[in-house]
Amino acid sequence: EEELQVIQPDKSVSVAAGESAILHCTVTSLIPVGPIQWFRGAGPARELIYNQKEGHFPRVTTVSESTKRENMDFSISISNITPADAGTYYCVKFRKGSPDTEFKSGAGTELSVRAKPS
């Protein structure tokens, strides 16, 4: 069986301030079992944007029903975008455990924020 891949098809997305941004992410396998998290940026300074397992992420909604066991689409929509949201977003698969461990990351999608049209 082929190892799971995390696919972020869009290299970049441009959104006007105040609008919503859709960031696409799919995985190619249901194995290993474990949650998806979204981060802005890479390395230790990365910001947690969405955690499938826990937390309250009011500006983020999942595009599909990510809680369904057979779901492989972990795309998200971030509402009310501001300039501070600009950056590269990574969809990251974790392997279930105590604690969960990072398994594989997508290649990233760069979000740029345009000025709100007047």
Partner: antibody, heavy 119, light 108 residues
Amino acid sequence: DVQLVESGGGVVRPGESLRLSCAASGFSFSSYAMNWVRQAPGEGLEWVSRINSGGGGTDYAESVKGRFTISRDNSENTLYLQMNSLRAEDTAVYYCAKQYDWNGFFDYWGLGALVTVSS
Amino acid sequence: ETVLTQSPATLSVSPGERATLSCRASQTVGSKLAWHQQKPGQAPRLLIYDASRRATGIPDRFSGSGSGTDFTLTISSLQTEDSAVYYCQQYYYWPPYRFGGGTKVEIK
């Protein structure tokens, strides 16, 4: 119920150090950025520092950069502020504040810890 | 850096009357503005976020409006327990997070 409880305040002399702690409960601590905000006697609110959810990203106000260090222990649900080379102008109540999401306002505040720097 | 200017510095209002507080940003902050209430000797408490959304448990006599650079906090019928200092906070550009200088609301 979200609770943030600061401790470690006290009276110190200029140039000395102090470490504040903030014990968090009632929410998934490791999922949220946290902040320190201070308020000098009779003055308004001044943001001091921010740390991201994982602890690897930090930001500081210019007035404390190089002297204060923010950190967190997600296994203990605790936020810290290490304050070195304290000055009289650092005298304030220091509040720990939870961020609503990574790029957001402060939705819960602690009760505060008083730090007095005086010779 | 975005500067937030609150006016008036002090507002004296009779119980049951309307109180209107202003917060002006030096550049647009979209709708990314929050209002916090701080009663004497207490920690701040979130009232309003995203310019007009009431935080959990906040009475509906508190309302927020505005976008861009001009924002208003309205207390429709002032109660004695509303005596406090009110601060606006922007979170459109950061760091640093910025607060306004505050408006003190006194009961006549």
